[in-house]
């Protein structure tokens, strides 16, 4: 008789999830010699241990602590790029500007990027059928708790000038409910972080508005200022040109505003 299985509203665990995590770990440690000492089998065991046999609506940050310990990594604290709702451009940027890092450029972020996972209470099975949706089912699910945990730690590590890339095409350029708005903003350490610099990325080619005056950006400025961190904001009117100028800064067209 088939066992009854909880049906959740979100997509199930990414197919070949264990192999993908292990393969990404091996690849990451090959590319980054400073992480070569990491034992990828132990990393996978710790990752699995965080959610296997546990109710997928009852996951805690504590469950991920063994994984966090194994994935401990030092990134230059003054080279951190946060992002909200504009992941692809942020990643394209750090691919070119190799001395800057998004969360997904770290081992733990890289392992989990774009993946979904969950288990079932009291069985060692991975649930490939469905996983809890943050809104429709529960917020303390394995994926959400993972990103909350690593995002908090990433923000806590930041220092000096921290950059954040925001999507100027969204109705809420700064969204208090995003991971950036609900976790990272509140975990920047005022004693270490001097300035948060927002880069607002424009979507339309003819869009010449100053999106730094957007009410949600003003709200972000207010939150940051209250935390004794300075705030600055720049419009990136032409993201394509912006990336091109990061690649070739000596190009004559790169002296004008981007």
């Amino acid at each position: 008789v088939p066992r009854w299985r909880q049906q959740w509203s979100g997509p199930g665990t990414t197919k070949r999830f264990p192999e993908t995590v292990l393969a990404r770990c091996v690849k990451y440690t090959e590319i980054h010699p400073e992480m070569r000492h990491v034992d990828c089998q132990s990393v996978w065991d710790a990752f699995k241990g965080a959610f296997i046999s546990k109710h997928p609506c009852n996951i805690t940050e504590e469950d991920y602590q063994p994984l966090m310990k194994l994935g401990t990594q030092t990134v230059p604290c003054n080279k951190i790029l946060l992002w909200s709702r504009i992941k692809d451009l942020a990643h394209q940027f750090t691919q070119v500007q190799r001395d800057m890092f998004t969360l997904e450029d770290t081992l733990l972020g890289y392992l989990a990027d774009d993946l979904t996972w969950c288990g079932e209470f009291n069985t060692s099975k991975i649930n490939y059928q469905s996983c809890p949706d943050w809104r429709k089912d529960c917020s303390n699910n394995p994926v959400s708790v993972f990103w909350k945990t690593v995002s908090r730690r990433f923000a806590e590590a930041a220092c000096d000038v921290v950059h954040v890339m925001l999507n100027g095409s969204r109705s809420k350029i700064f969204d208090k409910n995003s991971t950036f708005g609900s976790v990272e903003v509140h975990n920047l350490q005022p004693e270490k972080v001097q300035t948060l610099e927002a880069w607002v990325i424009h979507g339309g080619r003819e869009d010449s508005r100053d999106l730094c005056q957007d009410p949600t950006i003003k709200e972000l400025e207010s939150i940051i200022s209250k935390r004794n961190i300075q705030f600055s904001c720049k419009n990136i009117y032409r993201p394509d040109k912006f990336l091109q100028c990061v690649k070739n800064p000596e190009d004559s067209s790169c002296t004008s505003e981007i």
Epitope: V26, H37, C40
Partner: antibody, heavy 118, light 113 residues
């Protein structure tokens, strides 16, 4: 089952270029670096370099920096090694290699024999 | 570059004999972060690609007969075959898996009388 299938033997004139292919099955090449190794007749093994097919980042052994160009096509799960300005010194078997989920070079292609001769 | 030196370059033995071959690296392959030696041994039979035997200097790959043993640390490593079999006829290579560019030894060719 994880496998790397390489293209067939090549006989090429000195001064020409050649492009060798390596098609992976059983895994997505985005999840692994693809390395290339050279073995000259009756000689040892030399590491040429690797490509990360996810973002086309490459790393070469200094010796092969001007000789080899590594590329990849994720849509066909295939990696390529292009060798330029060929000389008799390039006559060798070329292997593509992947660690995939292992700590070592676990998966080797069967090798492509390149003969450079006029 | 890390230079890998293997000796002897060839040896001929009788089936059942014990064999040892040496591999020396010009720099230490011991990683201070985890105390592992990033030294790998491969076996290459005629007409085939190399096949892994030992990684981390002493960890035997699953499926590799236990007559194969790797030992050593830092710059000096040894591969031992406790009782050579006819099917062990091959060239054995050690590899620096510690630092780029990855480098291989010149190989030890094992022949059976």
């Amino acid at each position: 089952e994880v496998q790397l299938q390489q293209s067939g033997a090549e006989l090429v004139r000195p001064g020409a270029s050649v492009k060798l292919s390596c098609t992976a099955s059983g895994f997505n090449i985005k999840d692994s670096l693809i390395h290339w190794v050279k073995q000259r007749p009756e000689q040892g093994l030399e590491w040429i370099g690797w490509i990360d097919p996810e973002d086309d980042k490459t790393k070469y052994a200094p010796k092969f920096q001007d000789k080899a160009t590594l590329t990849a096509d994720t849509s066909s799960n295939t990696a390529y090694l292009q060798l330029s300005t060929l000389t008799s010194e390039d006559t060798a078997i070329y292997y593509c290699v992947s660690r995939y989920i292992n700590y070592y070079f676990a998966y080797w292609g069967q090798g492509t024999t390149l003969t450079v001769s006029s | 570059d890390i230079v890998m030196t293997q000796s002897p370059s060839s040896l001929t033995v009788t089936a059942g004999e014990k064999v040892t071959m040496s591999c020396k690296s010009s720099q230490s392959l011991l990683h201070s972060g985890n105390q592992r030696n990033y030294l790998t041994w491969y076996q290459q039979k005629p007409g085939q690609p190399p096949k892994l035997l030992i990684y981390w200097a002493s960890t035997r790959e699953s499926g590799v007969p236990d007559r194969f043993t790797g030992s050593g640390s830092g710059t000096d490593f040894t591969l031992t075959i406790s009782s050579v079999q006819a099917e062990d006829l091959a060239v054995y290579y050690c590899q620096n898996d510690y630092d780029y560019p990855y480098t291989f030894g010149g190989g030890t060719k094992l022949e059976i009388k």
